[in-house]
């Protein structure tokens, strides 16, 4: 039976050329986490696995880097980097647990500060 | 040019073990991960586990864990694959292959193979 | 792990055809699957990886598409040289799993 839950940074928006820390936290579970798949859509991102560590996509080396933690930084943000963000933690003996954000990339002006997770 | 050389043909008594080498040339060895496939007489391809030539980590499919041990010596650019307990079953063609970008990706180059048979 | 499956098993068709291999993942992949090429008593060799980039010095008359759990190798018009097994594999989750293979044959 799947106890754990996932909590993620939620809804967030960020600067356009900024950039931002994508984290979710596993919980109240005790599943060995083997690995972690962050997608942006139908697109894989970046894969933390617990034994290999992080593979960045080619697509996204540039853009993308790894942690903190589990975490992901996107860098360079454009207003096409809006859009749902998944954490898909692969766990044993409990299976696949998933994690949503909404990211919001707003022109300079506009961008809200102080968002949790934020990288001014 | 890159290729892998694999070491020769091996004949082994059940219970015994075999370790079959790898030997890179023709690009940096570090750089690239390193697999390590297996195809029994007849049948498909069985993917048994992955190393990164620069730090030694591993990840192994969980029907070798315990009897599967991958190593590298970066001194002679050189990977290898040893096998435990070996029985009927393990008798095949054993392949290393190069992952062409972090370790999700394609295997782009392989070694010739090596056979090894497992028989009383 | 994740399973997955390659239809048809094996197929026959003639030169010139135009021929489509199958793979279904158990779980969605994004497009991280590879297809090879595998002939009798050699190496396998990669055509596609990424689900639809074409390996370089592969044929442009392979072509690969396909995301989340299906996947499809289409081979444009069928050569001499194409006759062998293909298989699918997924990148995605460790451990990385193959398809059944798919075996092309002279009709």
């Known amino acids: 039976m799947m106890t754990g839950t996932i909590e993620t940074t939620g809804n967030i928006s960020a600067e356009k050329g900024g950039s931002i820390i994508l984290q979710c936290h596993l919980s109240s579970t005790t599943a060995q986490v083997t690995q972690v798949n962050w997608e942006q859509q139908d697109q894989l991102l970046a894969i933390c696995n617990a034994d290999l560590g992080w593979h960045i996509s080619p697509s996204f080396k540039d853009r993308v880097a790894p942690g903190p933690g589990l975490g992901l930084t996107l860098q360079s943000l454009t207003v096409n980097d809006t859009g749902e963000y998944f954490c898909i933690y692969h766990t044993y003996p409990d299976g696949t647990y998933t994690g949503r954000i909404f990211l919001e990339v707003l022109e300079s002006s506009v961008a809200e500060h102080g968002a949790r997770f934020q990288i001014p | 040019q890159v290729q892998l050389v694999q070491s020769g043909a091996e004949v082994k008594k059940p219970g015994a073990s075999v370790k079959v080498s790898c030997k890179a040339s023709?690009?940096?060895?570090?750089?690239?991960?390193m697999s390590w496939v297996r195809q029994a007489p007849g049948q498909g391809l069985e993917w048994m586990g992955i190393i990164n030539p620069s730090g030694g980590s591993t990840s192994y499919a969980q029907k070798f864990q315990g009897r599967v041990t991958m190593t590298r010596d970066t001194s002679t650019s050189t990977v290898y694959m040893e096998l435990s307990s070996l029985r009927s079953e393990d008798t095949a063609v054993y392949y290393c292959?190069?992952?062409?970008?972090?370790?999700?990706?394609?295997?782009?180059?392989w070694g010739q193979g090596t056979t090894v048979t497992v028989s009383s | 792990d994740i399973q997955m499956t390659q239809s048809p098993s094996s197929l026959s068709a003639s030169v010139g055809d135009r021929v489509t291999i199958t793979c279904r993942a158990s779980?969605?992949?994004?497009?991280?699957l590879n297809w090879y090429q595998q002939k009798p008593g050699k190496a396998p060799k990669l055509l596609i990886y990424?689900?639809?980039s074409l390996q370089s010095g592969v044929p442009s008359r392979f072509s690969g598409s396909g995301s989340g759990t299906d996947f499809t190798l289409t081979i444009s018009s069928l050569q001499p040289e194409d006759f062998a097994t293909y298989y699918c594999?997924?990148?995605?989750?460790?451990?990385?799993?193959f398809g059944g293979g798919t075996k092309v044959e002279i009709k």
């Open positions: 779980q969605s992949i994004s497009s991280y």
């Open positions: 292959a190069r992952v062409r970008y972090g370790y999700a990706d394609g295997m782009d180059v």
């Open positions: 023709g690009y940096t060895f570090t750089s690239y991960y």
């Open positions: 594999q997924q990148v995605y989750h460790l451990p990385f799993t």
């Open positions: 990424g689900a639809s």
